[in-house]
């Protein structure tokens, strides 16, 4: 089996985590995709998911999490806006393939959110002053309760992020985007031990 690794991201309160999950294969384009948190010793908890079938370029918002699936480029964009210290924890993207287990990504995100230089949003000189407005036309999708027992791992302490109720609009200042990419292994390639060099030797773009 392929070892799941973690990458650590340190952000300040009020900033934005912007993740690209690279699912690559066309057969996954319309599949429902989810963003999960893995709490210490527990099963992964789905915080947000796309619709089923997943719609192209159609934002789905659950609280401060926005998912957007770009079928034509094989990318799921996950944004967690206005980060709070309580959002610290271990996260992953998965693709639902019922009745099979979800397809997991290689790298999980160990997110650490710390207090900013001051309690006032926008006071950080190093941050941009963009205001993100999430349009109220975004959709909240119903997520399956199904999680894979294989994904239970030891997560960092303080993995207590909960998702607030959906907001119709989010104004966000003090934004720093962290762009990263992740890889999926296709089930067939695993079976045939044909894991691509791209997947084995991928590079991360921050």
């Amino acid at each position: 089996a392929t070892k799941l690794t973690e990458e650590k991201y340190e952000l300040k309160e009020g900033q934005t985590l912007d993740v690209k999950c690279d699912y690559t294969l066309e057969k996954f384009a319309s599949s429902q995709k989810a963003w999960q948190i893995i709490r210490d010793g527990e099963m992964p908890k789905t915080l947000a998911c796309t619709e089923r079938p997943s719609k192209n370029s159609h934002p789905v918002q659950v609280g401060r999490i926005i998912l957007e699936d770009y079928h034509d480029h094989g990318l799921l964009r996950v944004r967690m806006v206005n980060l709070q210290v309580e959002d610290s924890g271990l996260y992953q993207c998965v693709i639902y393939q019922p009745p099979k287990e979800p397809h997991m990504l290689f790298d999980r995100i160990a997110l650490v959110v710390t207090k900013g230089f001051s309690g006032t949003p926008g006071s950080n000189e190093n941050s941009t002053q963009n205001v993100y407005k999430i349009p109220p036309t975004t959709t909240k999708a119903l997520c399956p309760l199904y999680t894979s027992p294989r994904t239970v791992t030891q997560a960092p302490p303080k993995s207590t992020a909960d998702v607030s109720t959906p907001d119709s609009e989010i104004n966000l200042t003090n934004v720093t985007d962290i762009i990263r990419e992740q890889k999926l292994i296709s089930e067939e390639d695993l079976e045939q031990k044909l894991i691509s060099e791209e997947d084995l030797h991928h590079h991360h773009h921050h």
Partner: antibody, heavy 121, light 111 residues
Framework: EVQLVESGGGLVQPGGSLKLSCAAS????????MHWVRQASGKGLEWVGR??????????YYAASVKGRFTISRDDSKNTAYLQMNSLKTEDTAVYYC????????????WGQGTLVTVSS | DIVLTQSPDSLAVSLGERATINCRAS??????????LHWYQQKPGQPPKLLIY???NLESGVPDRFSGSGSGTDFTLTISSLQAEDVAVYYC?????????FGQGTKLEIK
């Protein structure tokens, strides 16, 4: 090991037709889009077109220079991609390569050795 | 269509010296800061070989003297220390939108 083997090339008169085949092995053929790329002698590479997978309804895309004359198809049960070339012109003379990408809009990691198509009277 | 223009058309560099090839796109080949621009090497009588994918990622098995950089419309392939076996034609290619396109190629020779 991934292998792509082209066949079907040869000499054909202008206005004629030819069908190229690309036999694939070493990977799950149905999972990936397949492309054709050509190269005239001493010239650069030209992307001819691609065919996507069943989950994308086998959608096809072509370069403007071949649109309406060339047709790409695939038979997943035979692990084979095809390039049907009609109304051939002398400028279609080239080595034709079959390539496999690494996924949606990803790079061409695997290439066949190519098959030569000569259009001449 | 996105036009890729490589420069120079040909290049002669001494063994052990740095070789730089540029590729300019007529419009951005990025989606979310994710550049769908790749580099290939082709030697006479052989099919092209992938060197760099998505602007800066080294393909497995390719010597680390090869590197790629750039985003948006401007990209560079660099060979840090030219070796005799690097003599070839180099192509950039974009897959951000259909139709996919290649640059016209840059011929690299030993000075």
């Amino acid at each position: 090991e991934v292998q792509l083997v082209e066949s079907g090339g040869g000499l054909v008169q202008p206005g004629g037709s030819l069908k190229l085949s690309c036999a694939a092995s070493g990977f799950t053929f149905s999972t990936y889009a397949m492309h054709w790329v050509r190269q005239a002698s001493g010239k650069g590479l030209e992307w001819v077109g691609r065919i996507r997978t069943k989950s994308s309804n086998y959608a096809t895309y072509y370069a403007a220079s071949v649109k309406g004359r060339f047709t790409i198809s695939r038979d997943d049960s035979k692990n084979t991609a095809y390039l049907q070339m009609n109304s051939l012109k002398t400028e279609d003379t080239a080595v034709y390569y079959c390539t496999r990408d690494m996924g949606i809009r990803r790079q061409f990691a695997y290439w066949g050795q190519g098959t030569l198509v000569t259009v001449s009277s | 269509d996105i036009v890729l223009t490589q420069s120079p058309d040909s290049l002669a560099v001494s063994l052990g010296e740095r070789a730089t090839i540029n590729c300019r796109a007529s419009e951005s080949v990025d989606t979310f800061d994710y550049s769908f621009l790749h580099w290939y090497q082709q030697k006479p009588g052989q099919p092209p070989k992938l060197l760099i994918y998505r602007a800066s990622n080294l393909e497995s098995g390719v010597p680390d003297r090869f590197s790629g950089s750039g985003s948006g419309t401007d990209f560079t392939l660099t060979i840090s220390s030219l070796q005799a076996e690097d003599v070839a034609v180099y192509y950039c290619q974009q897959s951000n939108e259909d139709p996919y396109t290649f640059g016209q190629g840059t011929k690299l020779e030993i000075k």
